[in-house]
């Protein structure tokens, strides 16, 4: 069987402060069963950026309709970007469990923030 792939096509994205950033992510299969989460940074200190099920992420919205059937596009849009948002963002697939188990991460997309043009 083909192994699940988590595809982040852009290695880097540059956005002007105050604009929105789109971070793209697709997966190659609906299975194994389990959620996708977005993080900034890697390792134990990484910051959770978006999880549709839990938490409150007012500046983050999924690009595709969250109610879309059999959706394999897990891209997100972050609004009102500030310099503090700079970093590398990872789209991560988890296997359903108690707790969920990290299965595979995308290669990451580095977000850089340009000064807002005057």
């Amino acid at each position: 069987e083909e192994e699940l792939q988590v595809i982040q096509p852009e290695k880097s994205v540059s956005v002007a402060a105050g604009d929105s950033a789109t971070l793209n992510c697709t997966v190659s299969s609906l299975i194994p069963v389990g959620p996708i989460q977005w993080f900034r940074g890697a390792g134990p200190g990484r910051e959770l950026i978006y999880n549709l099920k839990e938490g409150h992420f007012p500046r983050v919205t999924p690009v595709s309709d969250p109610t879309k059937r059999n959706n394999m596009d897990f891209s997100i849009r972050i609004s009102n970007i500030t310099p503090a948002d700079a970093g590398t963002y990872y789209c991560v697939k988890f296997r359903k469990g108690s707790p969920d188990v990290e299965l595979k991460s995308g290669a990451g997309t580095e977000l850089s923030v340009r000064a807002k043009p005057s």
Epitope: L30, I31, V33, G34, K53, P66, R69, N71
Partner: antibody, heavy 120, light 108 residues
Framework: EVQLLESGGGVVQPGGSLRLSCAAS????????MTWVRQAPGEGLEWVST??????YYADSVKGRFTISRDNSKNTLYLQMNSLRAEDTAVYYC???????????????WGLGTLVTVSS | EIVLTQSPATLSVSPGERATFSCRAS??????LAWYQQRPGQAPRLLIY???IRETGIPERFSGSGSGTEFTLTITSLQSEDFAVYYC??????????FGGGTKVEIK
């Protein structure tokens, strides 16, 4: 057209075993999680087990006794049922999972079911 | 485990009338709720998912509403083929997937 056809039901004594099969057609079987749901006579629906690719999930009532598996080359889902009890008597439905909200599953196609009767 | 409670257990309605019944979750399931119809001797059939989205081919007289812990399925102008048992199912937190106990819609 999606079709799911269960087979393998029958009458078995308590403590016995049965293997149910579900032949699937009309969709890309290997791309979807699959589920068994049962319905005791005159009762409601009870989730039994779900399989993704290598990942399997079971209701507490069947854990350790039932094993779900799939053969993607044959487009077939299986449920091996061991140590059967009277309370396992039910119609067993095979269902295709559909995913929404990034991680949740519901069941968009169902087979007609196969009856399992556990009785001495 | 999330418990789903459906009410009423039985609803007696005349053909052409409106039927409304509810599904209450023991904890927040957001919009992760589906509704199924089961006619006598048949397999369940998906009607609604994501609390309010009609499955392809389901007549417009079926509508779902609600979020969180309170959900409603409404059938406007009941047809003869609508007399059946209706189940809700949550998929927010699993395993286990859980179903409500069902509401039987019978002819008055």
């Amino acid at each position: 057209e999606v079709q799911l056809l269960e087979s393998g039901g029958g009458v078995v004594q308590p403590g016995g075993s049965l293997r149910l099969s579900c032949a699937a057609s009309g969709f890309s079987f290997s791309n979807f999680a699959m589920t068994w749901v049962r319905q005791a006579p005159g009762e409601g629906l009870e989730w039994v087990s779900t399989i993704g690719s290598g990942d399997t999930y079971y209701a507490d009532s069947v854990k350790g006794r039932f094993t779900i598996s799939r053969d993607n080359s044959k487009n077939t889902l299986y449920l091996q049922m061991n140590s059967l009890r009277a309370e396992d008597t039910a119609v067993y439905y095979c269902a295709k999972d559909s995913t929404v909200s990034w991680s949740g599953d519901f069941f968009d196609y169902w087979g007609l079911g196969t009856l399992v009767t556990v009785s001495s | 485990e999330i418990v789903l409670t459906q009410s009423p257990a039985t609803l007696s309605v005349s053909p052409g009338e409106r039927a409304t019944f509810s599904c209450r979750a023991s904890q927040n399931v957001k919009n992760d709720l589906a509704w199924y119809q089961q006619r006598p001797g048949q397999a369940p059939r998906l009607l609604i998912y994501a609390a309010r989205i009609r499955e392809t081919g389901i007549p417009e007289r079926f509508s779902g509403s609600g979020s969180g812990t309170e959900f409603t399925l409404t059938i406007t102008s009941l047809q003869s083929e609508d007399f059946a048992v209706y189940y809700c199912q949550q998929y927010y937190d699993w395993p286990p997937f859980t179903f409500g106990g069902g509401t039987k819609v019978e002819i008055k």
